[in-house]
């Protein structure tokens, strides 16, 4: 059928509550695009009547609440005036127990989010609620041990639980409890997150390392479209910012009327230790004006650049 | 909709209490935190603190910690924030406000504001 | 705290023209969950402020679309593309990541 397939990682999830997923594979989704959500290669859509307990909406698959038969490989097809991409997503579907006595309390989880707080800062955990504009979510409510958060050093703010003066005390097994809303029907959306203490600084204290570029030159013709990425490797918890600047400048800012030259979409793939984050700089049509214009890659406090080069002539054509 | 009313303007001696009261409507009272904000003539915005309905729960900006208490009547959907020992320099319009959605930050509910004139 | 500085202090603009503001925050806004925690507010007189962009470049809920905000972790842009009669007022930045919650100085615009 001439679609490109494309293999995203697998979502562990819990059963009984609310999921959503969206399709959007950048740069792909950004310009005008069919959505079409498949289950097992089925040749019937998902449905999109909002009734249906999955269905979908817009570019999201909906799942109102997610059941134990629901595990397997969704497609989700993208379809452009002159491209087509099949994007499978592996859904595991598992029972969770949260506080129920009997089976002793929180589960392990591993699986879950894992977030770190700072000791000795103020930090804050976030709920991740990843649902589509027709989900009205509700207040949201903290749980550590399985026992709602109060006290002075802890303030919910939207999807936000903040944390005053981190302790290591705080580390432990967490919950985040939200409402969601959806065609008069509630649900409720419980996220376990695990959570660890570290010393070490936080909010961009870590230097990130820009394995690609290397400050270098590369060669170009004239009027050819040219895309770079800038890979970055970083800690986990970093909340560093990558981008593509020229003459310190935002690549789109400065390129802001003819948008001849943009920064793409953040891509990160998460390893053990570190992740692993990508953003490219592509130039539409390479104009003289870019020649020996150094175009930085920032990432934190790291920088790196390149340099666009005429080819040397080619005698060997004449 | 989302409506806030705000309690008229009040004159106030140095050294004297002042109350300003915000009753909500069109949504449901005890879910959203009521923030107080203020400006001064020809300062800019200050954000005093804020209050959640649920839990009685204060988060006060330093500035203010001695001197505001915030408190509420659920039975008519009123928050008060009493700003106590009043100065010259108290003298301001205050504002409650409260925020987008429960998971969207940005006050895009106000109260139409009370001017407090604090003058010997 | 986090302390937010606009520039300029002042903007008088010819109706149809754009107009560009700027903040700086003394600490990065962007959150390791990805969302940055800056909005930006127009102050009419004798009106309560209003929400235009939230999130860094959101635009909320009733706001014109030739409103736009942009920025990084530390550095904002609000852009008006063709500046009307009705946006004149006083323009202001603010964060939320963390308590308390700031906002910058003020931007006021009028018009030429």
């Known amino acids: 059928d001439g679609c490109k397939d494309i293999f995203m990682k697998n979502e562990i999830l819990s059963a009984s509550q609310p999921f959503a997923f969206n399709c959007t594979f950048p740069p792909i989704t950004s310009g005008e695009v069919s959505v079409t959500w498949y289950k097992n290669s089925s040749k019937i859509p998902v449905s999109k009547i909002i009734q249906s307990r999955i269905h979908q909406d817009e570019t999201w698959i909906l799942f109102l609440p997610m059941e134990w038969g629901d595990s397997g490989v969704y497609q989700c097809v993208i379809k452009g005036r002159d491209s087509c991409h099949r994007i499978h997503v592996n859904l595991t579907v598992f029972e969770k127990h949260w506080c129920d006595t009997s089976i002793g309390g929180l589960p392990n989880l591993s699986d879950e989010y894992k977030q770190i707080l700072h000791l000795g800062k103020d930090d804050s955990l976030t709920c991740h609620l990843h649902f589509p504009k027709s989900c009205v979510l509700g207040p949201i409510k903290w749980y550590k041990d399985c026992n709602e958060i109060k006290g002075e050093r802890f303030t919910v703010l939207e999807t936000r639980l903040l944390v005053s003066n981190v302790s290591a005390e705080d580390r432990g097994n967490y919950a985040c409890q939200a409402i969601l809303t959806h065609s008069g029907k509630q649900y409720e959306v419980l996220n376990g997150i695990t959570v660890s203490i570290t010393e070490r600084a936080g909010y961009g204290g870590s230097v990130p390392k820009i394995i690609y570029p290397k400050n270098h030159s590369i060669e170009v013709q004239l009027g050819t479209t040219l895309i770079v990425d800038c890979n970055v490797t970083d800690t986990k918890d970093n909340t560093n910012l990558r981008c593509w600047r020229v003459n310190n400048t935002l690549v789109d800012d400065y390129y802001d009327e003819s948008k001849r030259i943009r920064e793409g979409v953040e891509t990160h793939v998460s390893f053990r230790e570190h992740n692993l984050y990508t953003v490219n700089i592509t130039f539409l049509e390479v104009k003289m004006e870019d020649y020996g214009l150094p175009f930085m890659c920032h990432a934190g406090v790291s920088t790196a650049y390149i340099i666009l080069q005429l080819p040397a002539p080619d005698f060997r054509a004449y | 909709q989302v409506q806030l009313v705000q309690s008229g303007a009040e004159v106030k001696k140095p050294g004297a209490s002042v109350k300003v009261s915000c009753k909500a409507s069109g949504y449901t009272f005890t879910n959203y935190w009521m923030n107080w904000v203020r400006q001064a003539p020809r300062q800019g915005l200050e954000w005093m603190g804020m209050?959640?309905?649920?839990?009685?729960?204060?988060r006060l900006n330093q500035k203010f910690k001695d001197r505001v208490t915030m408190t509420r009547d659920t039975s008519t959907s009123t928050v008060y924030m009493e700003l106590s020992s009043l100065r010259s320099e108290d003298t301001a319009v205050y504002y409650c406000a409260r925020t987008t959605s429960m998971i969207i930050g940005g006050f895009a509910y106000w109260g139409q504001g009370t001017l407090v004139t604090v003058s010997s | 705290d986090i302390v937010m500085t606009q520039t300029p202090l002042s903007l008088s603009v010819t109706p149809g023209q754009p107009a560009s503001i700027s903040c700086r925050s003394s600490?990065?806004?962007?959150?390791?969950?990805?969302?940055?925690?800056f909005y930006w507010y127009l102050h009419k007189p004798g009106q309560p402020p209003q929400l235009l962009i939230y999130?860094?470049?959101n635009l909320a809920s009733g706001v014109p679309d030739r409103f736009s905000g942009s920025g990084s972790g530390t550095d904002f842009t609000l852009k008006i593309s063709r500046v009307e009669a009705e946006d004149v007022g006083v323009y202001y930045c603010a964060q939320n990541l963390e308590l308390p919650l700031t906002f910058g100085g003020g931007t006021k615009v009028e018009i030429k």
């Open positions: 600490k990065s806004l962007l959150h390791r969950n990805a969302i940055t925690y």
């Open positions: 209050f959640h309905p649920y839990g009685d729960v204060t």
């Open positions: 999130q860094m470049s």
